[in-house]
Amino acid sequence: ARNGDHCPLGPGRCCRLHTVRASLEDLGWADWVLSPREVQVTMCIGACPSQFRAANMHAQIKTSLHRLKPDTVPAPCCVPASYNPMVLIQKTDTGVSLQTYDDLLAKDCHCI
Amino acid sequence: ARNGDHCPLGPGRCCRLHTVRASLEDLGWADWVLSPREVQVTMCIGACPSQFRAANMHAQIKTSLHRLKPDTVPAPCCVPASYNPMVLIQKTDTGVSLQTYDDLLAKDCHCI
């Protein structure tokens, strides 16, 4: 169940897709990736207030228990609901190769 | 890739499965669930230090960028990797029914 998409904390404050520009050096990939030199990393960032984009029943339970026991149970967390694949040109022993990664860039987000 | 299971913060401090006892009232279910009266809710709680139980490439990227830009990029978060199903006895218009929920109780955890 994809619950409310209205953010009670104000525009852009709740769980959503953000893009962070990162170099191969930033990612620690410079020794094994040749291209692209820079990656527009899409990731899920933001708060998960009550029922906002709750991924499932577990997220709803977590919200309820966090309200009761905030020191024990954390609030739901903003994480990828799905991913976009990406191809990298990698160094190999014999030269270069292409490799697809299907869990690298967040496509959309939810709270869990 | 299920990366290191050694917690550098000390025993039990990193992302792992916890059990929290909750009543139907705690969960806000008292008006639609008859049984069980109490649920042993298994959930994922704990810190996600560098490469600890990294779920995938995205989690590894997040760790790298959090180290570089801690105010912009949050650390990976401890969430369920899979779930255990649970059956509830529910109230219905005509009486009671059994309903299985497959996304209610965390089975194991990872960082993402």
Epitope: L34, S35, P36, R37, E38, Q40, N84, P85, M86, V87, L88, I89, V96, L98, T100, D102, L105, K107 | -
Partner: antibody
Amino acid sequence: EVQLVQSGAEVKKPGESLKISCKGSGYSFTSYWIGWVRQMPGKGLEWMGVIDPDGSYTIYSPSFQGQVTISADKSISTAYLQWSSLKASDTAMYYCARYGRYGTYFDYWGQGTLVTVSS
Amino acid sequence: QSVLTQPPSVSGAPGQRVTISCSGSSSNIGVLYVNWYQQLPGTAPKLLIYSNDNRPSGVPDRFSGSKSGTSASLAITGLQAEDEADYYCQSWDSSSNYVFGGGTKLTVL
């Protein structure tokens, strides 16, 4: 506006060499890979290879490895496909295409260059 | 012989819904994405659907993509005369990198 403009049609004899071009405009040429795709008369699409114009890294389909050479000149935003010795079976339409930002699909295509090899 | 298998031809009347299938294996579609291209007669291919079910801007919502297991499909609703074209699926295969289906000729009756 993103555009890939390819060189004109070529008629060649077997054994001759050839270099066709693909000029990119309307975007940062070095930020996107370029691929080459062959379409033989009445047939489907075949991926030939890819080049990263920034570092000039090239990767070829096993079917085309050693048969063609892909290169790029980033100073003039142009990618190339060349043959050192053409065969009649090289007769086809050749397309250059820009890879989308994830490198998984082709988001813009050139108009194609028809290469005819006949004695 | 293509790594991805498509029917050679499909047809439909204007206004109808048609689907084009693309069958692969666990080394391509089964684990990764599928893209679809439209090639109108005498023109270059054009991206229609990327990453299974995403439409680039400018592509009508009559076109939709889906993937299940090792197969994918392209659906076209409200068929129009200008949809008559060749359609190609494309994915990635660990042995040969980018791979295309053999193409499907869509005829609007």
